[in-house]
């Protein structure tokens, strides 16, 4: 008996061939001997089966001795043995229809789990193997689960269902809802304007939700809500903004915030959360601000940084075009009685300058 695998919702064509290459009488029946369709001369006739409105044939092939049964919009319950009667012969084809669906939604938040469920006909024992867009293979039976979805899991998942040494392939598009970056750091000199950007890693037609930026300043004992906003059809509208600092927010995606000036009291870490409509959970992006200040008070030249710096960062004070006078893995360095000239305060990571502030020291007479 020939086995054909079909996909739920698709169209399948079951073949039936006569030895005579001409149009002769044929019938397709199901395992209960109920007629599905056949012919009467050059006319297609249909029986009382439940496939009535979804069954068809190709009349153009009858003259060649081919009498296919076409079943549209396949359902799991269409799985059956179909019998083609032609020239006093019976050809049997076993059709097995499978369906593969993602749990609840194909748009999932980063960190959530994806469950793929296989619908299969009674009596079948299929195996399923899925390949994620990043090349990870998972195997299972009726259900497959992937916990802790990552951004790289966005894309087309290709799943192969194997039954009776035949296979059928499913493609499921999964969108992992997340920010492009989990964390970012902005380095600024005191007084400079600060821009924070929160690009999303996905695009959808309409995007609705609400968000908030909480800020933990290094100098503050507790965190503070800096801004709350709504997102409707991709348009951003500010609901509430703190008076200090007076943030500005762009009205279009990607989410974008501007701080008029970097000040030591703003240095710290923020957490932007975005709750999307009809989704449980929130998207998060961490943002960090490091602020540098170089000052000269009487005979003391000081350079300080505030904010979340890593212990391996180096803070240096040097006279332009000269070797560093002082270089430490600390958040403040100073030089007593600095000589006249343009001094540079540098914050660097393995030789790469992250932040630089210049201060002119005038000669003392």
């Amino acid at each position: 008996k020939k086995v054909v695998l079909g996909k739920k919702g698709d169209t399948v064509e079951l073949t039936c061939t006569a030895s005579q290459k001409k149009s002769i009488q044929f019938h397709w029946k199901n395992s209960n001997q109920i007629k599905i369709l056949g012919n009467q001369g050059s006319f297609l006739t249909k029986g009382p089966s439940k496939l009535n409105d979804r069954a068809d044939s190709r009349r153009s092939l009858w003259d060649q001795g081919n009498f296919p049964l076409i079943i549209k919009n396949l359902k799991i319950e269409d799985s059956d043995t179909y019998i083609c009667e032609v020239e006093d012969q019976k050809e049997e084809v076993q059709l097995l229809v499978f369906g593969l669906t993602a749990n609840s939604d194909t748009h999932l938040l980063q960190g959530q789990s994806l469950t793929l469920t296989l619908e299969s006909p009674p009596g079948s024992s299929p195996s399923v193997q899925c390949r994620s867009p990043r090349g990870k293979n998972i195997q299972g039976g009726k259900t497959l689960s992937v916990s802790q979805l990552e951004l790289q899991d966005s894309g087309t998942w290709t799943c192969t269902v194997l039954q009776n040494q035949k296979k059928v392939e499913f493609k499921i598009d999964i969108v992992v809802l997340a920010f492009q970056k989990a964390s970012s750091i902005v380095y600024k000199k005191e007084g400079e304007q600060v821009e924070f950007s929160f690009p999303l890693a996905f695009t959808v037609e309409k995007l609705t939700g609400s968000g908030e930026l909480w800020w933990q300043a290094e100098r503050a004992s507790s965190s503070k809500s800096w801004i709350t906003f709504d997102l409707k059809n991709k348009e951003v509208s500010v609901k509430r903004v703190t008076q200090d600092p007076k943030l500005q927010m762009g009205k279009k995606l990607p989410l974008h915030l501007t701080l008029p000036q970097a000040l030591p009291q703003y240095a710290g870490s923020g957490n932007l959360t975005l709750a999307l409509e009809a989704k449980t959970g929130k998207l998060h992006q961490e943002v960090n601000l490091v602020v540098m200040r170089a000052t000269q008070l009487q005979k003391n030249l000081t350079c300080e940084v505030w904010g979340p710096t890593s212990p391996k960062l180096m803070l240096s004070l040097k006279l332009e075009n000269k070797e560093a006078k002082v270089s430490k893995r600390e958040k403040a360095v100073w030089v007593l009685n600095p000589e006249a000239g343009m001094w540079q305060c540098l914050l660097s990571d393995s030789g790469q300058v992250l932040l630089e502030s210049n201060i002119k020291v005038l000669p003392t007479w």
Partner: antibody, heavy 118, light 107 residues
Framework: EVQLLESGGGLVQPGGSLRLSCAAS????????MSWVRQAPGKGLEWVST????????YYADSVKGRFTISRDNSKNTLYLQMNSLRAEDTAVYYC???????????WGKGTTVTVSS | AIQMTQSPSSLSASVGDRVTITCRAS??????LGWYQQKPGKAPKFLIY???TLQSGVPSRFSGSGYGTDFTLTISSLQPEDFATYYC?????????FGQGTKVEIK
């Protein structure tokens, strides 16, 4: 063809009221934000107000906040600007504009003139 | 509110000239900037959005550039129909603000 036609302008005394209308055609009105922009005689362009699409968020310039009200009737494809407590400095040509998908004002009407004078 | 400063306020040029108009924002506005052209007695015409994207139907002699606070509108070879007033508009957030305009006149 996308078209915007303003009406309702005229001469009004200071402290008076006026309601401007803008009839839209040639596009799916309910899916786009709409705005009013004005231009005083011999002066530059000044944004007045915006109403987002069917959600209906409204935004105003500080100079008109509390006096002007923007609204829309999606069933009639019409945008309105209710202007109360009018002042001499509100004298201008008022343009109705349509926002595109990127929220830029891409289509403008021909304008209607509002004169506030005693 | 974000202030938009346009310069020059007016300029005289001849047909075929290359013309540059600049617009400066009082704070960073990404590339959320549009350019409009207005002729006397007419409604403004939309030329450029997102700082550098030409609106369909606008001749390719018009181009825009910039990001953050500094933006430029360039007309590579001025044509007779280009004599008009040009406005920049910040579309970063509300209130939307226009530059004061640059009048391009015939020399």
């Amino acid at each position: 063809e996308v078209q915007l036609l303003e009406s309702g302008g005229g001469l009004v005394q200071p402290g008076g009221s006026l309601r401007l209308s803008c009839a839209a055609s040639g596009f799916t009105f309910s899916t786009y934000a709409m705005s009013w922009v004005r231009q005083a005689p011999g002066k530059g362009l000044e944004w007045v107000s915006t109403i987002s699409d069917n959600i209906g968020n409204t935004y105003y310039a500080d100079s008109v906040k509390g006096r002007f009200t923007i609204s829309r009737d999606n069933s009639k494809n019409t945008l309105y600007l209710q202007m109360n407590s009018l002042r001499a400095e509100d004298t201008a040509v008022y343009y109705c504009t349509k926002d595109n998908e990127d929220y830029y004002m891409d289509v403008w009407g021909k304008g209607t003139t509002v004169t506030v004078s005693s | 509110a974000i202030q938009m400063t346009q310069s020059p306020s007016s300029l005289s040029a001849s047909v075929g000239d290359r013309v540059t108009i600049t617009c400066r924002a009082s704070q960073g506005i990404r590339n959320d900037l549009g350019w409009y052209q207005q002729k006397p007695g007419k409604a403004p015409k939309f030329l450029i959005y997102a700082a550098s994207t030409l609106q369909s139907g606008v001749p390719s002699r018009f181009s825009g550039s910039g990001y953050g606070t500094d933006f430029t509108l360039t007309i590579s070879s001025l044509q007779p129909e280009d004599f008009a007033t040009y406005y920049c508009l910040q579309d970063y957030n509300y209130p939307r603000t226009f530059g004061q305009g640059t009048k391009v006149e015939i020399k």
